[in-house]
Interface confidence: low
Amino acid sequence: AQGKEVVLLDFAAAGGELGWLTHPYGKGWDLMQNIMNDMPIYMYSVCNVMSGDQDNWLRTNWVYRGEAERIFIELKFTVRDCNSFPGGASSCKETFNLYYAESDLDYGTNFQKRLFTKIDTIAPDEITVSSDFEARHVKLNVEERSVGPLTRKGFYLAFQDIGACVALLSVRVYYKKCPELLQGLAHFPETIAGSDAPSLATVAGTCVDHAVVPPGGEEPRMHCAVDGEWLVPIGQCLCQAGYEKVEDACQACSPGFFKFEASESPCLECPEHTLPSPEGATSCECEEGFFRAPQDPASMPCTRPPSAPHYLTAVGMGAKVELRWTPPQDSGGREDIVYSVTCEQCWPESGECGPCEASVRYSEPPHGLTRTSVTVSDLEPHMNYTFTVEARNGVSGLVTSRSFRTASVSINQTEPPKVRLEGRSTTSLSVSWSIPPPQQSRVWKYEVTYRKKGDSNSYNVRRTEGFSVTLDDLAPDTTYLVQVQALTQEGQGAGSKVHEFQTLSPEGSGNLAV
C-alpha cells in the first residue's frame, strides 16, 4: 500500500499569507507575486549576484510537529545561470542551503543562525539560461530531503542564500503514515512511519467481523516502513465456521450450504442424505435414518449401517467348520465394513445352548474381520453349533439394530487323530496320535488298523485306550499302511489319513527312533 502524506506546511497553497521572516530584514529574500495560468502565484526570490559575500536567510513560520517523527521537505525552485549575468558575475552562485531548527516554542521574530542545523546544499538539476528566461521558459527544479528523528514540539526551516539568483515557488513539508489497510481479512490501523531509515515497525492487525486467527496460526501483523509503505505481511485471519470470504469481508453461508471450520475454503453445498441448512450453517443435519460418525468430515454424505452379509455357508470338516459369506448388498454408503463372528453350541440330548467362544479356536480374531471367511476348529463331536456373522460399519454403533446372518452345523464325528511314527526296528513300529482335548472325554477307545502295502487281502486291528501303540511281529524292510480311528459311544469317529511307515532292513540294528 502506498504511503499516506500528512502535510505540515505548504507555502504554495497558502497564497502568500505565511509571512516568513527574512534576515537581514528588507534585503535578500523577497516575497513576489506572479500570474501563471491566470492565477496569482507567490514565490520568495533573491538575486544579489553582483554584490559578493551574501548571507541572506529566509525562515519559515514555526511548524507544529504533532506526531511526525521524520519529516520530508519538497522544494520547487528555479536557479538562473550565472553566465546570464554581465561578466559572469564572479561572486554569483547556483546553489543555496537548507537548514532546520527544533524548538518547543515559537521564537517569533527572534532569529538566531546558531540554532539552525544544515540539512543539505540544494543544487539545481537544471539552470535557467538567458534565452529561456527571456522566453519565460524557466526550468523548475524539484528536490526532496528528509530529517529525523524529530523530538521537540515544533521546528523551523531556513533557506540561506550565498549569492544565487533563486526563486522558491513551493515548500511542502509533510510526514508519512502507513495508511489504514485491509489485508488477509485483517484490519491494520493508520500508523506513523518511523524515523530510522531502514526500520520496520511491527503492527498487529485485527480480524474483520466473523474472521478468526486459525488454531496454531500466526496473528496477523504487518511492518510499517519509514516511507509509509506496508510490507512483510505475517499471519492471516480466516472466515470462521459458517462464513466465507467475499472480497474483504466474511459473509454467512447461504441456505443449503455450510462451512464447518475456519479456513480459506468457500461454503460447500450440503452433501447427500442431509436436510437443507439455514443461513450461516456450520454443518448439515442428517436425514432420518442416516448418520454421521464422529470421525466423518462434514463434507461427507450421511450414511447408515450396512445390511446383513448376503450369503453365509458353514462347511464341516471333522471337528472344523469353514464359514464363508459375501458382502452386504447395501453398504450403507460406506467403505469401512467389518465383520464379527459369534458362536453358540447346543447339546442335542438336553437342547441346552450357550456361548462357545472360550472352547473353540478361530483362524483369526473373530471381531473386526475384513475378509469374508474364517475357520473355526476345536469343535466337540455330536454337538450342534450356530454361527452368527454380523456386518458393521462406522455408524453401526449409533443404532441399536444389528445386521447379521446365521448358519448352523452339527458335528457328528471327532476330528481325525494326528498320527506320528515315534520309533521303528526291523520287526516293529511305534505309533502315537493326538486329538483336541475337548474331544478326548468322548473317546472310548482308539482303533489302529494296519496292513502290508500292496496286500489288500489281510489287515490287522489293535485297540487301546491310550495315545500310542507298538505294532510287533512285522516283517523287516517292509512298508505298512497305518490308520487310527477314535471310537465313541455313539460309534466311530473320523479316521486319520492312511500313513506309510517302513520297518528297518536287517542290516540296521536296534530300535531306532525316527
Epitope: P198, S199, L200, T202, A225, D227, L231, V232, P233, I234
Partner: antibody, heavy 115, light 107 residues
Framework: QVQLLESGGGLVQPGGSLRLSCAAS????????MSWVRQAPGQALEWMGT????????YYPDSVKGRFTISRDNAKNSLYLQMNSLRAEDTAVYYC????????WGRGTLVTVSS | DIQLTQSPSSLSASVGDRVTITCKAS??????HSWYQQKPGQAPRLLIY???RLVDGVPDRFSGSGYGTDFTLTINNIESEDAAYYFC?????????FGQGTKVEIK
Amino acid sequence: QVQLLESGGGLVQPGGSLRLSCAASGFTFSSYTMSWVRQAPGQALEWMGTISSRGTYTYYPDSVKGRFTISRDNAKNSLYLQMNSLRAEDTAVYYCAREAIFTHWGRGTLVTVSS
Amino acid sequence: DIQLTQSPSSLSASVGDRVTITCKASQDINNYHSWYQQKPGQAPRLLIYRANRLVDGVPDRFSGSGYGTDFTLTINNIESEDAAYYFCLKYNVFPYTFGQGTKVEIK
C-alpha cells in the same frame, strides 16, 4: 556508535546444543528488531531468524524451525540464539544484526559441528 | 519460497571501471531488495535498501536500481577498496533469502 558482539561459538558434536549471545551497545536495544544470519565457509549468507523489539514475535526459516530459538533480554541489551540437534551443515559463522534487514552487523562467532 | 539468482559469480575490474551486478528474483518482490558488501574476514555491510536507496556513509559511486524481479547494483569509477563480495537480499516476506554472492576483484 552501534556495536554488536557475538559470543558462545565453538566446537560441538552432532546432535549437541549451543547457545550464542549477542551484546548490543550504542543504541536503544529495546526499540529494535534483531536478527541472526549465518555464513557457512565460502558460502552465501543465510537468514536464521528475527525477533521483534519486545520479543513478542519470532520468525524462522523452515530449515531451523523447531531446532533454533531466538530470544532476547532487553534489560541486559542481549540477544540469544539457542541451537539444538546441531548437524554438520550448521557449521558457519553466526552474525547478529540489527533490524530485520540487517542495517548493522557484529563480527560473528564461529560454530563448528563435528565429531 | 522466492529464490534470488545473482550474476556474475565473480568479476575482475580495473580502477575507474564501471561494474554492474544483477540479481533476479523468481517472483515479483516489488522493490523490497537490498545489497550488502562483505570484505574478507569482516561482517557484511548494508549498502542499498529498497532497491535504490543509499545508506548514509556509503560512497555515491554505489547505486541500485530495479523493480519487480530484476535488480542491479552499479559501482561507478570503482576503487581498489571496493574489492569484496556483494550479496543481494529480498525482504518483502519471510523467509528472507540472499543471492549466492559476487566476488569483485581489482586488477
